[in-house]
């Protein structure tokens, strides 16, 4: 058993049918010695008397808010949460496996640049009685500071019969140098509590590996005289690290017909312009990627050919 | 500890092409190592990230773009002085700081070259003959060093008398390649910045 926060405790249980559970001793936070009784949640049934209460915690019915009283007055509370270990592996019931970029990916994180700012998000089908708390650091043995905000509900979607909820959090490394070569990964730890179930999820990454630039901005077409060709031009996104000559991007220019089945023409360039043939009803899209370290491509910025 | 904007004309910078070749070569070699050594811990998540140049060179600090010198987190206190003549410095206007940066890159390349050659000698003794260093990568390191053309004492190749532990050597190869790829990215960024300045 360990303390999650004041008066909230997590009991770790080896979770299998007929498991013996864990013996827990609760102590009433009071100078009083006599006439103390214990109850669980809203029940008035007295579970025991005395300054300490010994309980065998086996399943969720044994978890909850234990309260010690004296003469009708509440003295203190202890909330017991359960953390299930199923065959050597901590349970992951609360969050959905996003399966990207690989199986067992519960937390996904992205950074728009090398400033040390990043966003993480996760999915759940649970809509109520759910709280998250996020901590982060650079490295784990001698951790350096990363400050995270509060997790917020950022999107809701319908997936088949289920509603899916997306939560996200923004974090900022306290002293980040965009040019630095990372040798220690960023660690992100999310505590999730649903009703009386506690789970924790972690992700470890280098900022360089989670870079995903914003799409190029100011995408424009300039028709070339007496030709089906157009000059496409664009600019680096505002959120990208500067100077651009040091933090350079490379670009992919795509000409896509109205039908998804039509052949796509693609051109790769380090410049901020390209000459392409504009077909009728087609659209031109441009996306960006770090020129020297191949992390994710940005989303497409698009303009119609007409 | 930083690069002023007064640097050579774009066409006067022969190192850019070599640094791009270097990044390509080390990335290919790392990919090959990951595939060949699939049963070894060779992914970025599994290896310890060690920098053999730590406390010996200060490339990131010495080559910091002018725009980032206002960022206190970028100004590390490590100072190292280097020999300051080189053929990539194609303009007399080139400052001492730029020479310091390029000579730091040269020292990095020299250290990695020695490590890779020593490692290759060990890998050639492996009866499994599982993996060797790409000669192209070694040649590209050499080409960039020649383009930088700094006078520097030659570092003797490390020779080891004990029987090599091939498992450890292959893990060390992965560690070295990951670190060298990261340094090659920095070198490419620096060359691109200098070329544009």
């Amino acid at each position: 058993i360990w303390e999650l926060k004041k008066d909230v405790y997590v009991v770790e249980l080896d979770w299998y049918p007929d498991a013996p559970g864990e013996m827990v001793v609760l102590t009433c936070d009071t100078p009083e010695e006599d006439g103390i009784t214990w109850t669980l949640d809203q029940s008035s049934e007295v579970l025991g008397s005395g300054k300490t209460l010994t309980i065998q915690v086996k399943e969720f019915g044994d978890a909850g808010q234990y309260t010690c009283h004296k003469g009708g007055e509440v003295l203190s509370h202890s909330l017991l949460l359960l953390h299930k270990k199923e065959d050597g592996i901590w349970s992951t019931d609360i969050l959905k496996d996003q399966k990207e970029p690989k199986n067992k990916t519960f937390l996904r994180c992205e950074a728009k640049n090398y400033s040390g700012r990043f966003t993480c998000w996760w999915l759940t089908t649970i809509s109520t009685d759910l709280t998250f708390s996020v901590k982060s650091s650079r490295g784990s043995s001698d951790p350096q500071g990363v400050t995270c905000g509060a997790a917020t509900l950022s999107a809701e979607r319908v997936r088949g019969d289920n509603k899916e909820y997306e939560y996200s959090v923004e974090c900022q490394e306290d002293s980040a140098c965009p040019a630095a070569e990372e040798s220690l990964p960023i660690e992100v730890m999310v505590d999730a509590v649903h009703k009386l179930k506690y789970e924790n999820y972690t992700s470890s990454f280098f900022i360089r590996d989670i870079i995903k630039p914003d799409p190029p901005k100011n995408l424009q077409l300039k028709p070339l005289k007496n030709s089906r060709q157009v000059e496409v031009s664009w600019e680096y996104p505002d959120t990208w690290s500067t100077p651009h000559s040091y933090f350079s991007l490379t670009f992919c220019v795509q000409v896509q017909g109205k039908s998804k089945r039509e052949k796509k023409d693609r051109v790769f360039t380090d410049k901020t312009s390209a000459t392409v043939i504009c077909r009728k009803n087609a659209s031109i899209s441009v996306r960006a990627q770090d020129r020297y370290y191949s992390s994710s491509w940005s989303e497409w910025a698009s303009v119609p050919c007409s | 500890r930083n690069l002023p904007v007064a640097t050579p004309d774009p066409g006067m910078f022969p190192c850019l092409h070599h640094s791009q070749n270097l990044l390509r070569a080390v990335s290919n070699m790392l990919q090959k190592a990951r595939q060949t050594l699939e049963f070894y811990p060779c992914t970025s998540e599994e290896i310890d990230h060690e920098d053999i140049t730590k406390d010996k060179t200060s490339t990131v600090e010495a080559c910091l773009p002018l725009e980032l010198t206002k960022n206190e987190s970028c100004l590390n206190s490590r100072e190292t002085s280097f020999i300051t003549n080189g053929s990539c410095l194609a303009s007399r206007k080139t400052s001492f700081m730029m020479a310091l940066c390029l000579s730091s890159i040269y020292e990095d390349l020299k250290m990695y070259q020695v490590e890779f050659k020593t490692m290759n000698a060990k890998l050639l003794m492996d009866p499994k003959r599982q993996i060797f260093l790409d000669q192209n990568m070694l040649a590209v390191i050499d080409e960039l060093m020649q383009a930088l053309n700094f006078n520097s004492e030659t570092v003797p190749q490390k020779s080891s008398l004990e029987e090599p532990d091939f498992y450890k050597t292959k893990i060390k190869l992965c560690i070295l390649l990951h670190a060298f790829r990261i340094r090659a990215v920095t070198i490419d960024r620096v060359m691109s910045y200098l070329n544009a300045s």
């Epitope: 080896d14 979770w15 299998y16 049918p17 969720f60 270990k85 065959d87 690989k102 199986n103 067992k104 | -």
Partner: antibody
Framework: QVQLVQSGGGVVQPGRSLRLSCAAS????????MHWVRQAPGKGLEWVAF????????YYADSVKGRFTISRDNSKNTLYLQMKSLRAEDTAVYYC????????WGQGTMVTVSS | SYVLTQPPSVSGTPGQRVTISCSGG????????VKWYQQLPGTAPKLLIY???QRPSGVPDRFSGSKSGTSASLAITGVQAEDEADYYC????????????FGTGTKVTVLG
């Protein structure tokens, strides 16, 4: 004590369907994940499928994906395996099993796919 | 498609020490716990070892398990005639959990 009693096995022609059941008693069935495991005659153990305690997530071996469906009825304390488009290679003893460091197995039920 | 490899058979005379190996990889045994099962002919498997080296109550102490790196082993110290059975190791793969990964199985024969 924990008990898993299986039923539903038998002889079936290729291409036909069969449903196996596993009745649980002696524990809070709705709190635990459950597996199906099979063993072809003279062969080793092969995992077939898993279902979470609340039925929210299901996982299948590639060899049965799209043909077999694992389900549970927590009100009846019963686990099911619906098997469709059966093949000769599905011939095996099928076991249900609880998920956890200490597990309990059903007695097994024989499924024979033969024309 | 078994990724946990066991020897097909091992044998020993009563009182001898018999060991069975179970070889895997970094993503399974290297990252997860190992179990061992005993299966007597015509019966369901019986758990012998969980969490690499833990014995459930009721399992004789002549059975012991260990794990090192990407492989595990089961030892029967002072093998007895009633130990003649098939033995399976089991773990998970970190990418496919909760799918159970079973070993290929080992037939233990007690001679004499």
């Amino acid at each position: 004590q924990v008990q898993l009693v299986q039923s539903g096995g038998g002889v079936v022609q290729p291409g036909r369907s069969l449903r196996l059941s596993c009745a649980a008693s002696g524990f809070t069935f709705s709190s635990y994940g459950m597996h199906w495991v099979r063993q072809a005659p003279g062969k080793g153990l092969e995992w077939v499928a898993f279902i979470r305690y609340d039925g929210s997530n299901k996982y299948y071996a590639d060899s049965v994906k799209g043909r077999f469906t694992i389900s549970r009825d927590n009100s009846k304390n019963t686990l099911y395996l619906q098997m469709k488009s059966l093949r000769a290679e599905d011939t095996a003893v099928y076991y249900c099993k609880t998920h956890g460091s200490h597990d309990n197995w059903g007695q097994g039920t024989m499924v024979t796919v033969s024309s | 498609s078994y990724v946990l490899t066991q020897p097909p058979s091992v044998s020993g005379t009563p009182g001898q020490r018999v060991t069975i190996s179970c070889s895997g990889g970094r993503s399974n045994i290297g990252s997860n716990t190992v179990k061992w099962y005993q299966q007597l002919p015509g019966t369901a498997p019986k758990l012998l070892i969980y969490d690499n080296d833990q014995r459930p109550s009721g399992v004789p102490d002549r059975f012991s398990g260990s794990k090192s790196g990407t492989s595990a082993s089961l030892a029967i110290t002072g093998v007895q005639a009633e130990d003649e059975a098939d033995y399976y190791c089991q773990s998970y793969d970190r990418g496919t959990h909760p799918a159970l990964l079973f070993g290929t199985g080992t037939k233990v024969t007690v001679l004499g």
